[in-house]
């Protein structure tokens, strides 16, 4: 049953809450068999995904999986939003689900909402910070 299709392992509704000013690595886990595909990141603007051309990216290779990483050095408030990775392989374009970054601005960190407030007010754009932690609702 082992398929040699390229797979991008970003789950639907995946989210990260991060703090402005911190470094952050957004990972796109990629499975491929022989030739590594060309992978890019884009940021969603409405229904359009705008390719991130001049951002620092890197590959991390592990035994059964590779990661195409988008680096935030550091995270800025306007990095808030949804991102998608795409792989080009043998003329096929494979797109991942989007993953959302919720950026808390350090300037308002002292006024950040509590966990309880967050639970009762999920519409808040800026989330309480848990570095590298995934939130799912």
């Amino acid at each position: 049953k082992e398929s040699c299709d390229v797979q991008l392992y970003i789950k639907r509704q995946s989210e990260h809450s991060i703090l402005a000013g911190d470094p952050f690595e957004l990972e796109c886990p990629v499975k491929y068999c022989a030739n590594r595909p060309h992978v890019t990141w884009c940021k969603l603007n409405g229904t359009t995904c705008v390719k991130l051309e001049d951002r620092q990216t890197s590959w991390k290779e592990e035994k059964n999986i590779s990661f195409f990483i988008l680096h935030f050095e550091p995270v800025l408030p306007n990095d808030n939003g949804s991102y998608r990775c795409s792989a080009n392989f043998q003329s096929n374009l494979i797109e991942s689900h989007s993953t959302t970054l919720y950026v808390t601005d350090v300037k308002s960190a002292s006024e950040r909402p509590s966990k309880d407030e967050m639970a009762s007010r999920p519409w808040l754009l800026y989330r309480h910070h848990h570095h590298h932690h995934h939130h799912h609702h």
Epitope: K1, S3, Y9, Q13, R84
Partner: antibody
Framework: QITLKESGPTLVKPTQTLTLTCTFS??????????VSWIRQPPGKALEWLAH???????RFNPSLKSRLTITKDTSKNQVVLTMTNMDPVDTATYYC?????????????WGQGTLVTVSS | DVVMTQSPLSLPVTLGQPASISCKST???????????LNWLQQRPGQSPRSLIY???KLDSGVPDRFSGSGSGTDFTLKISRVEAEDVGVYYC?????????FGQGTKVEIK
Amino acid sequence: QITLKESGPTLVKPTQTLTLTCTFSGFSLSTFGMGVSWIRQPPGKALEWLAHIYWDDDKRFNPSLKSRLTITKDTSKNQVVLTMTNMDPVDTATYYCARGNWDGETYFDYWGQGTLVTVSS
Amino acid sequence: DVVMTQSPLSLPVTLGQPASISCKSTQSLLDSDGKTYLNWLQQRPGQSPRSLIYLVSKLDSGVPDRFSGSGSGTDFTLKISRVEAEDVGVYYCWQGTHFPWTFGQGTKVEIK
């Protein structure tokens, strides 16, 4: 060979908590893309998805039952456990666990044999 | 929730003849990633479900090629080109595009 097998009580009383275990072999739940779901089927009725746990311990629940459900995994034992609180006779069903494989998204490619749970006093 | 509606609910078929089952969803199953997460299961009498087709038309391993899937958006079809005795059972479509994942009510295929 991939197999999944459900185990747990066949009879529970109303208001009690149901604990079901899915023991699987032939794959690892730590592998990217892998997951396990619980799905139930009341007698003579259609299937209803309950909960899913992913390779990285991320979880998803059916919102209509979320407050009653927990799902956990023990990768070393190849087990996934579902608990459902406050059982009611309408929860009488065959409960299946299924492997979630991945092709851009989860699909269920292997199913357990199912275990019939009756809720009655 | 996305409601999946199958028709017919009962399908008497003649051995060796084709059969077709329709599945309609209340929302488009085309995902923003460009894929359509519509799947089909077979449940033979007294057995647990078995995966037949995923991503609208991909046959799962070990599934005979007399089965095929087609469709897009909200309208999907499962076809059996020549029904065999072992095809008797209930067929379910289900969607994995929107949470919660939801199933059709099932179509019972029986031999005339």
